[in-house]
Amino acid sequence: AAPCPDACCPHGSSGLRCTRDGALDSLHHLPGAENLTELYIENQQHLQHLELRDLRGLGELRNLTIVKSGLRFVAPDAFHFTPRLSRLNLSFNALESLSWKTVQGLSLQELVLSGNPLHCSCALRWLQRWEEEGLGGVPEQKLQCHGQGPLAHMPNASCGVPTLKVQVPNASVDVGDDVLLRCQVEGRGLEQAGWILTELEQSATVMKSGGLPSLGLTLANVTSDLNRKNVTCWAENDVGRAEVSVQVNVSFPASVQLHTAVEMHHWCIPFSVDGQPAPSLRWLFNGSVLNETSFIFTEFLEPAANETVRHGCLRLNQPTHVNNGNYTLLAANPFGQASASIMAAFMDNPFEFNPEDPIPVSFSPVDTNSTSGDPVEKKDETPFGVSVAVG
């Protein structure tokens, strides 16, 4: 095959090699860019910057090599459009630094930076950490800082991500209140900070105020939906990013729902309870307190992380006719109480007969109003009561 005369030539089914001296000063308009998985660039001394727009349209790119070229600067968001990138070789360029943001969000198996005049500073603390943790093949490169010695020996005591403290109201918050949160940011070289409020939706009206180093957030007219929702303050410097999440507890009264008993392995009377603080629960059976046991007990489902409502079952492992009756769930917290009742019939009473049946005896009733909550049978105290055991 005749040699390829272009600046960039196909290599394999989805690769491109650009090795002709000085032919490129940017990566715009590469042929077949959208299908490329491998891009090899060498000897491009005019290629000095790598920015977001350079790699737009290279969504399938997995291997990127830019070596022995003039690369001085890689933008923090340069690889935003190449999320599949797993091998990045930028060796023998003119890079003095590389932001932690550049590689954030990528799953790099290999990162090669040898042969660059790196400048040791806190901005390379992340790379030093990669070296310490054996990531991306970095330790094998024995990276040096220009005129400063090995990267591994760079002092890092002062290289910390920002420190965040979020102040939340310690008094009880009620539905309809306004809540002021403040995020204090400390640290060197602060670059950006803000709030992440994606979980809040309709939980409150949001107003942001202030800037570094003290960010304010007012949550106006809060609803009970705000409970269990994360309000997150974040800040970044050249070392990395810090986030702190808090939750605001909005008090509201207990509520309860009961549903028809269902057979699930044994039996379950499903319920839902809500309230902040979490309500205490009590069951009644036919108006008397039901003492829970290993065969009749409350079992909660795994709670959803972002809501206060709890779902569960009153488990009845072996209910018979003596367990038929009215079940009431009482829920209470300091802001109110609620109850719900449901009739449950698990099994016909084998001692009950159709009154038209010609059987000349009366049958002793079952007292389901046991205060202990344990199934109890009492014999009828009338003189003509006859007990019949049905086997």
Epitope: H265, H266, N291, E292, T293, S294, F295, F297, T298, E299, F300, R315, N317, Q318, P319, T320, V322, M347, S372, D374, P375, V376, E377, A389
Partner: antibody
Framework: QVQLVQSGAEVKKPGASVKVSCKSS????????MHWVRQAPGQGLEWMGE????????NYNEKFKNRVTMTVDISISTAYMELSRLRSDDTAVYYC??????????WGQGTTVTVSS | DVQLTQSPSSLSASVGDRVTITCSAS?????MHWYQQKPGKAPKRLIY???KLASGVPSRFSGSGSGTDYTLTISSLQPEDFATYFC?????????FGQGTRLEIK
């Protein structure tokens, strides 16, 4: 697999207390009730009580109510049964057993407690 | 308390025999459960909810009954079946066991 491993044999004097442990593994400790059952030499099985780690709920057999205390340490998935004011007729093998929807599915290997002066 | 009375208290039988153990409750219980215990070992669940076989239990074991009268049947005794059998109720506190039936080789 599910395992209930009990503490070793104990010899106690009358009037003393004994605390038997039952370490669980192979299942979610908080989802199951733990029962304690004892068996005197050559005798039948006697239920002492039950505890639900999830809510700390306890039910005791009236016979032992003033002498027995059942507790759990959720962090190490372990249940405990303490019996106080021991008498010679408390000499028995003490078992733990777990239940959720069915009774006493799995049992510990037993702990022999001997009460002797 | 619900008293459970097993009969017989002891029983001699031969390999291949059909054996029935009964358990009578002092008041109606919803279900009965059966355990097998061998000397020096913890009890092992045999039958639960009156008639359900626990995992790994051979089908020669069966249970039946309702109300106050329950039965454990072994259709054809095997050498490993010689042990003590207990019934248990799980319907009211305190949970109670029968006094046991010792099954011996004739």
């Amino acid at each position: 697999q599910v395992q209930l491993v009990q503490s070793g044999a104990e010899v106690k004097k009358p009037g003393a207390s004994v605390k038997v442990s039952c370490k669980s593994s192979g299942y979610t400790f908080t989802n199951y009730w733990m029962h304690w059952v004892r068996q005197a030499p050559g005798q039948g099985l006697e239920w002492m009580g039950e505890i639900y780690p999830n809510q700390g709920r306890v039910n005791y057999n009236e016979k032992f109510k003033n002498r027995v205390t059942m507790t759990v340490d959720i962090s190490i998935s372990t249940a405990y049964m303490e019996l106080s004011r021991l008498r010679s007729d408390d000499t028995a093998v003490y078992y733990c057993a777990r239940s959720r929807y069915d009774p006493m599915e799995d049992w510990g290997q037993g702990t022999t407690v001997t009460v002797s002066s | 308390d619900v008293q459970l009375t097993q009969s017989p208290s002891s029983l001699s039988a031969s390999v291949g025999d059909r054996v029935t153990i009964t358990c009578s409750a002092s008041s109606s219980v919803g279900y009965m459960h059966w355990y097998q215990q061998k000397p020096g070992k913890a009890p092992k669940r045999l039958i639960y909810d009156t008639s359900k076989l626990a995992s790994g239990v051979p089908s020669r074991f069966s249970g039946s009954g309702s109300g106050t009268d329950y039965t454990l049947t072994i259709s054809s005794l095997q050498p490993e079946d010689f042990a003590t059998y207990f019934c248990q109720q799980w319907s009211s506190i305190p949970l109670t066991f029968g006094q046991g039936t010792r099954l011996e080789i004739k």
